[in-house]
């Protein structure tokens, strides 16, 4: 059979091989489709409710307005001709439609690098056969579940028209100290040979990097965090990332109900502001990072270094 | 919403011609195939006529054949059926319905109009 | 031309009953029949296309089946609204032939 590929929407003409060009003529076009259950014949003579379908020309073609789904499937002609020589043609139709172009919904503005982040939803709708969508990252294909890349996809048909719309989450985990502004794209490819992939726009979220947690540092004055009774510590909650998170401070686990700070004072030091203190950064589109805990102790006099243990209390210190 | 107006039914003499109208509206008239069918008084349904989307293609039962023509006008969404050389037995409400071809089949109907053909 | 033989011309029944109503086709016409129900002064009205499919806000205690050239309109419960007049058609060849009606009255 020879292999006929049309467009959905489009006019086909299938030609009788053999045919006389006029009537009177010999011959009938047999169809197995999806509008069929077996056969079905129509006749030069025919005309009647398949003519919106397919019908055939005084020629002896036939003719099909617009070709839809239900027309893939099997065309045949015997025809034939003034000397009784008979001639058989065979056609295997399928059909095609190419979507709009791509889109990337839901696209982030922003990602995270070393967590896994929604890039965005590639959509294509209006295709047949169904075709695949994929993901591009600076012009390369990005291959799901390597390198911490995963796709979500989904390919719904719509009822009437019997197209696909298809669907293609992208998640990634951005690699630390990698490229801040990636550019990713997503294409479709349609189902049948011989058609060009339709490409996305790009799109190119920033890669946040968030300060690792060793980097939220707390430095104690004075060193050891080991003062005299009614003496003063310095607490200092240094962070590199910016801007500037927001810092509260934690003694022995609890939330100290302050405002927030990057230092903390405890003048006049006395046995309830004993304990073990850390600081928490967070920022405005990350999870909270806390520093190493410190121990704050009371020297009494005549003794060397910190004491061992810790007597939690209930004092406040003060902000700088 | 789909709706089908007929009109132009009445009594008419035997050899008399009469043209009914049916206004379509709802849907977008010229991808549709249109038909009338017939009802004969505590009879059942009788096709008449269809004609294609583009009014180039019209189909008849040799009952009619050579006596109705069937036709539309679809900058006006409207179809109609000219009859002529009628008789006693083309008396019946008339109605106008949507399809006729094997991607519809006849899918809406109007409320139809009554022929009467007598002397 | 295609005869489309409808049975029973007509049936008497109770609401509740289940009614079916059969259609045989002189020729393969395909999957290519309708099933109407007209009330008396009315336009018809399709309650299944190509042959198993329930139209648009028809009830579904109708159904279509098909097997080879019959056709049978099914009403699984009948209630009050549905005593009418059944008219089957098919619509793969020319003439579109309609059945020759069948009329559910109350027993």
């Known amino acids: 059979a020879q292999n006929i590929t049309a467009r959905i929407g489009e006019p086909l003409v299938l030609k009788c091989k053999g045919a006389p060009k006029k009537p009177p003529q010999r011959l009938e076009w047999k169809l197995n489709t999806g509008r069929t259950e077996a056969w079905k014949v129509l006749s030069p003579q025919g005309g009647g409710p398949w003519d919106s379908v397919a019908r055939v020309l005084p020629n002896g073609s036939l003719f099909l307005p617009a070709v839809g789904i239900q027309d893939e499937g099997i065309f045949r002609c015997q025809a034939m001709n003034r000397n009784g020589k008979e001639t058989k043609s065979n056609y295997r139709v399928r059909v095609y439609q190419i979507p709009g172009k791509p889109e990337i919904v839901d696209s982030a503005s922003e990602l995270t690098a070393g967590v896994p982040n929604k890039v965005g939803t590639c959509v294509s709708e209006g295709s047949y056969p169904a075709g695949t969508l994929s993901w591009h990252l600076d012009g390369k294909p990005l291959v799901p579940n390597e390198k911490g890349v995963s796709v979500k996809e989904q390919t719904r048909r719509h009822p009437e028209t019997g197209l696909f719309t298809l669907q293609s989450e992208l998640m990634v985990t951005p690699a630390r100290g990698g490229d801040p502004r990636p550019t990713f794209s997503c294409s479709f490819s349609p189902g049948l040979p011989r058609h060009r992939a339709l490409r996305t726009a790009p799109i190119q979220p920033r890669v946040w990097e968030p300060v690792p947690l060793e980097e939220v540092q707390l430095v104690v004055e004075p060193e050891g965090g080991a003062v005299a009774p009614g003496g003063t510590v310095t607490l200092t909650c240094e962070v590199p990332a910016q801007p500037s998170p927001q810092i509260h401070w934690m003694k022995d686990g609890v939330p100290l109900p302050l405002p927030p700070s990057p230092v903390l004072i405890l003048p006049e030091i006395g046995p309830q502001d004993q304990g073990t203190y850390s600081c928490v950064a967070t920022h405005s589109s990350h999870g909270p990072q806390e520093s190493r805990a410190v121990s704050i102790s009371i020297i009494e006099p005549g003794e060397e270094g910190p004491t061992a243990g810790s007597v939690g209390g209930s004092g406040l210190g003060t902000l700088a | 919403e789909v709706q089908l107006v007929e009109s132009g039914g009445g009594l008419v003499q035997p050899g008399g011609s009469l043209r009914l109208s049916c206004a379509a509206s709802?849907?977008?008239?010229?991808?549709?195939?249109m038909t009338w069918v017939r009802q004969a008084p505590g009879k059942g349904l009788e096709w008449v006529a269809s004609i294609d989307n583009s009014g180039d293609n019209t189909y008849y039962p040799d009952s009619v054949k050579d006596r109705f023509t069937i036709s539309r006008d679809n900058a006006k969404n409207s179809l109609y059926l000219q009859m002529n050389s009628l008789r006693a037995e083309d008396t019946a409400v008339y109605y106008c319905a949507r399809g006729g071809d094997i991607v519809v089949g006849l899918d809406h109907w109007g409320q139809g109009t009554l022929v009467t053909v007598s002397s | 031309d295609i005869q489309m033989t409808q049975s029973p011309s007509s049936l008497s029944a109770s609401v509740g009953d289940r009614v079916t109503i059969t259609c045989r086709a002189s020729?393969?016409?395909?999957?290519?029949v309708n099933w109407f129900q007209q009330k008396p002064g009315k336009a018809p009205r399709r309650l299944i296309y190509?042959?198993?499919n329930l139209a648009d806000g028809v009830p579904s205690r109708f159904s279509g089946s098909r097997s080879g050239t019959d056709f049978t309109l099914t009403i699984s419960s009948l209630q009050p609204e549905d005593f009418a007049t059944y008219y089957c058609?098919?619509?793969?060849?020319?003439?579109?032939?309609f059945g020759g009606g069948t009329k559910v009255e109350i027993k």
């Open positions: 190509r042959a198993t």
């Open positions: 709802g849907f977008t008239f010229n991808n549709y195939w």
């Open positions: 058609l098919e619509f793969d060849e020319h003439p579109l032939t």
């Open positions: 020729q393969d016409v395909g999957i290519y």
